[in-house]
Interface confidence: low
């Protein structure tokens, strides 16, 4: 007789999600003998890289690589040693690096080079660091959500693969520098750039996706700050009693605030700005972020971008979840309808700094920004994307599914490691009793 070696029990994959405000590392695992099953890949562990995103290291590229060391050291411990060499490692950068690439391509290249240098020092199967397009970010987020919720195919008790009838879920992602909306649609695309055709497990999917650069939470806050400096001597979205010194260089260095940038300004000047707790003026300020004046297609979302009518149920994750969760949990406000979401935003915007601090003890940092965040989410969904009360009823705000963070990272890895076959598995699993 000869020894029969057991197949390796688990495989692992690592994705570094290099967002605009921070980087997160996700380690995924799956049974090696079930690679083509759906919903079989799950999150093994994760790690938040402290500090800013890699794009914040434009002046210090080596620091971008160095910043990842703590999490990579954790990966060495979290992935069994004998699996290190066979574990694919990817880094994907999103809108923060897309912005840096627009304004300073040399710095963008230097940051990616530095990050690559660090990642190649580790014993994993490093497969590249690159900037994702907005379209990829949207589609991979959609793939992640539907994969985790097992919306693509299901494994029946008779051992046959079948596609469930529940359909797919749309995905809405609110990052730091961009926001994405992606959903399955039957409408033909009037703008080919917004349509993606996918073949997964033998099924064909026509998906609409669009990424709005500069509409991520952090960039929106910067743009509102720039607008407040331009049009008011106060910030209507900040609470009354809150005051801070704003460094003009920080406000105007982003390409997202270029429209509000004065012809000449002292980048090292500090301007004192106070809040006024004015929900109506804040709403007006947020409204100014959206343009509905021209649409070259039969219908648009905003800024002249084609969008078919929203259809089906949606999962809204990342900062959509954090914003709504703050209203729901920290503030104790109902947000089940669009009307309630608007009322909740107004409620937060009405609070003074002292009232907010009393309502949410121990969470003072950035507390002043929740009003603007809530107002933006409400306007983006209702006016921007065109959700009415009925459609909004089908939106769930959730950051995890099947104990795994929802975001583009898992979908990206599934795609690059071919863990979702285009065609259904050739062999049936189990026994056929029919």
């Amino acid at each position: 007789t000869r020894d029969i070696r057991e197949p390796p029990a688990l495989k692992y994959g690592i994705v570094l999600d290099a967002g605009s405000s921070h980087t997160s590392m996700f380690i995924y695992k799956w049974p090696a003998d079930k690679e083509n099953d759906t919903g079989i890949v799950g999150q093994h562990s994760s790690c938040d890289v402290p500090g800013g995103g890699i794009s914040s290291y434009a002046d210090n590229p080596s620091g971008a690589g160095q910043s990842l060391v703590g999490c990579l050291e954790q990966a060495l411990r979290d992935v069994p040693k004998e699996r290190h060499a066979g574990t694919p490692l990817y880094l994907g950068a999103t809108a923060g690096m897309r912005l840096l690439n627009l304004t300073n391509p040399e710095a963008s290249t230097s940051v990616l080079t530095a990050v690559t240098h660090t990642l190649t020092q580790y014993p994993f199967d490093f497969r590249g660091a690159r900037i994702l397009s907005g379209q990829e970010e949207g589609v991979f987020g959609w793939v992640t959500a539907n994969y985790l919720l097992e919306n693509f195919i299901k494994y029946g008790w008779v051992g046959r693969w079948f596609r469930p009838r529940k359909g797919t879920l749309g995905a809405m992602d609110l990052g730091g520098a961009s926001t994405q909306i992606t959903f399955e649609t039957t409408s033909p695309a009037e703008d080919r750039a917004s349509e993606v055709q996918l073949r997964l497990y033998g099924q064909h999917y026509r998906v609409y996706t669009h990424s709005f650069l500069c509409y991520g939470r952090d960039q929106v806050l910067q743009r509102l700050l720039a607008s407040a400096l331009q049009t008011h001597s106060f910030h209507p979205c900040w609470p009354r009693g809150f005051s801070t010194h704003v460094l003009l260089g920080d406000v105007y260095q982003s390409p997202c605030t270029v429209a509000q940038r004065p012809q000449t300004f002292n980048s090292s000047a500090r301007v004192s700005l106070s809040g006024s707790s004015d929900p109506h003026l804040c709403r007006d300020l947020v409204s100014g972020l959206f343009s509905f004046s021209s649409c070259p297609f039969s219908r648009c979302s905003f800024n002249g971008v084609f969008q078919p009518p929203v259809a089906g149920n949606f999962i809204a994750f990342s900062a959509f979840f954090y914003t709504v969760n703050f209203l729901r949990t920290s503030m104790g406000l109902p947000v089940a309808t669009l009307q309630q979401l608007e009322a909740a935003a107004v409620n937060v915007c009405n609070q003074t700094w002292a009232q907010l601090q009393a309502r949410v003890p121990g969470q003072q940092a950035h507390l002043a920004d929740y009003c603007a965040g809530a107002m933006f989410v409400q306007q983006l969904l209702s006016r921007g994307y065109g959700f009415d009360e009925r459609a909004f009823g089908g939106v769930i705000f959730q950051k995890k599914a099947a104990d795994t963070a929802v975001g583009w990272a898992l979908g990206y890895m599934l795609n690059l490691t071919n863990l979702i076959p285009a065609d259904p598995p050739g062999l049936r699993k189990g026994t056929d009793f029919s």
């Epitope: 938040d48 402290p50 914040s56 910043s67 060391v69 914003t323 969470q363 950035h366």
Partner: antibody, heavy 125, light 106 residues
Framework: QVQLVQSGAEVVKPGASVKISCKAS????????MDWVKQAPGQRLEWIGD????????TYNQQFKGKATITVDKSASTAYMELSSLRSEDTAVYYC??????????????????WGQGTLVTVSS | EIVLTQSPATLSASPGEEITLSCSAS?????IHWYQQKPGQAPRLLIY???NLASGIPARFSGSGSGTFYTLTISSVEPEDAAVYYC?????????FGGGTKLEIK
């Protein structure tokens, strides 16, 4: 109340090792990382490393890799740091510090909210 | 690593005076914390995330700043404020501290 109590001062010979302890009380020990910080005479504070007591995961400042080993005894709510191959430049006060945090939009922001009283380690022949 | 430079190294102030301590980073950081250390004692958290007052810290302490420049202000110095003040960044690994500013009360 939340307290970190460290072991007493140590005088050790060059080349030897020393293990100092930090006993936590007043909170759930496994809910917070424990960090160690060095303060040499006339020098700035230096972060050495930390440990996640829940998962026994430690991370080190590259400068202290091989010098410091951080461990925990969960049942005793105690963190330990062993310093090896001691030299005169290791003479310092060593602090344990609890890593406090707050969550904002899903990102953890960290700081040292509670400190031990410090342990003086003197390396002398 | 990010180097934090604090100035002045030593500062002498009279009770009731307003003073400002500065902390300059060698490259941009997201936020910083401030700690106070009195002789023979461990450091104590004063301000976290640039401008948030830690529990039990008097309102005369305030912090501000962004990017590479941060300040700690004491609006009306009291005798018990005599201490060394350290800034600390948690934006870039390894986490680093400033060299400290020693505040003496006249």
């Amino acid at each position: 109340q939340v307290q970190l109590v460290q072991s007493g001062a140590e005088v050790v010979k060059p080349g030897a090792s020393v293990k100092i302890s930090c006993k936590a009380s007043g909170y759930t020990f496994t809910d917070y990382n424990m960090d160690w910080v060095k303060q040499a005479p006339g020098q700035r504070l230096e972060w050495i490393g930390d440990i996640n007591p829940k998962y026994d995961i430690s991370t080190y400042n590259q400068q202290f890799k091989g010098k410091a080993t951080i461990t925990v005894d969960k049942s005793a709510s105690t963190a330990y740091m062993e310093l090896s191959s001691l030299r005169s430049e290791d003479t310092a006060v060593y602090y344990c510090a609890r890593r406090g945090f707050f969550l904002y939009y899903g990102i953890n922001y960290y700081y040292f909210d509670v400190w031990g009283q410090g342990t003086l380690v003197t390396v002398s022949s | 690593e990010i180097v934090l430079t604090q100035s002045p190294a030593t500062l002498s102030a009279s009770p009731g005076e307003e003073i400002t301590l500065s902390c300059s980073a060698s490259s941009s950081v997201s936020y910083i914390h401030w700690y106070q250390q009195k002789p023979g004692q461990a450091p104590r958290l004063l301000i976290y995330s640039t401008s948030n007052l830690a529990s039990g810290i008097p309102a005369r302490f305030s912090g501000s700043g962004s990017g590479t420049f941060y300040t700690l202000t004491i609006s009306s110095v009291e005798p018990e404020d005599a201490a060394v003040y350290y800034c600390h960044q948690w934006s870039s690994y390894p986490w680093t501290f400033g060299g400290g500013t020693k505040l003496e009360i006249k």
